[in-house]
């Protein structure tokens, strides 16, 4: 049945990086406003984003309890104004959203390199490890904490004075890699969950080039 | 007339639950939304919970998140607020309102029901 | 959360002079799809629950006398009391819902000087 004056949201849509995660919908409110509702398949139905005007809803906090449940959330469509004044007091409008696992489909967000060393024809590249919005004990976990050895991580690298890109990987958060002496070389990595079917791969991050102030030179 | 009728409140110790009730009159009340509303004693307003006119939709403020649930039964025009685990600083007036012309604008407000948490 | 800051704490005023409030908001509550703002002032007596005096900033309630005016956009606003009566005296609050939670002002509290 539904509300007078009100239209069902839809195009839900998740858009999630690192576990920060947002619901977004159409269409823009023209005498409606929303009422999101997020639950797991076996749990009950929270409210957030209560009478919103937004077209969209922030639902991390919900789903950082335990990314990988499975989740679905739906959307409400209320007259903007009492129900009295504005129509007959149905059924609201909603409409489901898709189902969405944290972990399974966050993106990986672009990862830093956070430094690099070179020891004699050795270079040290090290990947920042990432917070996250997951908590356990009341500290937040970085991405290998939530991934584990899921994470993996590409590096690719070549000399400055050449295209040819080789490739390097680990799961961990540290590359170690053998270099021609006096060469320069730049860098660029990937996060990868080899694992997954869908988004399984981050964007590259910014390159970094030896010479520039991330790295540290030292002869041996 | 609209009238709202707060009852339930009480001297409860610390830990203990209560159940507030607003019976409404005068107005079709499936048709609202409804909130309680506190004022601890000499204290300004605290808003601590809304439920949708369909009773689907229910939202808390922080601070009773997890202990205090809305509820409503349209076939007998009341709004209820049960209180769990209650705290010294839930000592408050409660009342119930009425959505107004918009969603959290009060146009009707009961004459409060007084909770004292004290051991 | 949007934060609610009135000012001054208590106001004292004669008899038929003018009485201002003001509130201010954390953040705007003003949508901008319709232009209102998402703004209320009730007023509180001793012993009894609040009354709807103005929302949407600036429209008065049915019922109330026009000597109430409210007036402001964005993140500050003033309820504005013309000509003082001693019925007036009460506790003043203003509240956004423009967002949930909804919150309150800490109030204003006016009386005869």
């Known amino acids: 049945s539904g509300t007078t004056n009100t239209v069902a949201a839809y195009n839900l849509t998740w858009k999630s990086t690192n576990f920060k995660t947002i619901l977004e919908w159409e269409p823009k409110p023209v005498n409606q406003v929303y009422t999101v509702q997020i639950s797991t398949k076996s749990g009950d139905w929270k409210s957030k984003c209560f009478y919103t005007t937004d077209t969209e809803c922030d639902l991390t906090d919900e789903i950082v309890k335990d990314v990988k449940q499975t989740y679905l959330a739906r959307v409400f469509s209320y007259p903007a104004g009492n129900v009295e004044s504005t129509g007959s007091a149905g059924e609201p409008l909603y409409e489901n959203s898709p189902e969405f696992t944290p972990y399974l489909e966050t993106n990986l967000g672009q990862p830093t390199i956070q430094s690099f060393e070179q020891v004699g024809t050795k270079v040290n590249v090290t990947v920042e490890d990432e917070r996250t919005l997951v908590r356990r004990n009341n500290t937040f976990l970085s991405l290998r904490d939530v991934f584990g050895k899921d994470l993996i991580y590409t590096l690719y690298y070549w000399k400055s004075s050449s295209s040819g890109k080789k490739t390097a990987k680990t799961n961990t958060n540290e590359f170690l890699i053998d270099v021609d002496k006096g060469e320069n070389y730049c860098f660029s990595v990937q996060a990868v969950i080899p694992s997954r079917t869908v988004n399984r791969k981050s964007t590259d991050s910014p390159v970094e080039c030896m010479g520039q102030e991330k790295g540290e030179f030292r002869e041996i | 007339q609209v009238q709202l009728v707060e009852s339930g409140g009480g001297v409860v110790q610390p830990g203990r639950s209560l159940r507030l009730s607003c019976a409404a009159s005068?107005?079709?009340?499936?048709?609202?939304?409804m909130h309680w509303v506190r004022q601890a004693p000499g204290k300004g307003l605290e808003w601590v919970a809304v439920i949708t006119y369909d009773g689907i939709n229910k939202y808390y403020a922080d601070s009773v998140e997890g202990r205090f649930t809305i509820s409503r039964d349209n076939s007998k025009n009341t709004l209820y607020l049960q209180m769990n685990s209650l705290r010294a600083e839930d000592t408050a007036v409660y009342y119930c309102a009425r959505d107004g012309v918009y969603y959290g604008v009060y146009d009707y407000w009961g004459q409060g029901t007084l909770v004292t948490v004290s051991s | 959360d949007i934060v609610m800051t009135q000012s001054p704490d208590s106001l004292a005023v004669s008899l038929g002079e003018r009485a201002t409030i003001n509130c201010k908001s954390s953040?705007?509550?003003?949508?901008?799809?319709?232009?209102?703002?998402?703004l209320a002032w009730y007023q509180q007596k001793p012993g009894q629950p609040p009354k709807l005096l103005i929302y949407w900033a600036s429209t008065r309630e049915s019922g109330v006398p026009d000597r109430f005016s409210g007036s402001g956009s964005g993140t500050d606003f003033t309820l504005t009391i013309s000509s003082l009566q001693a019925e007036d005296v009460a506790v003043y609050y203003c509240q956004q819902f423009h967002s949930y939670p909804l919150t309150f002002g800490g109030g204003t509290k006016v009386e005869i000087k």
């Open positions: 005068g107005f079709t009340f499936r048709s609202y939304g």
């Open positions: 953040q705007s509550v003003l949508f901008s799809s319709n232009n209102k703002n998402y």
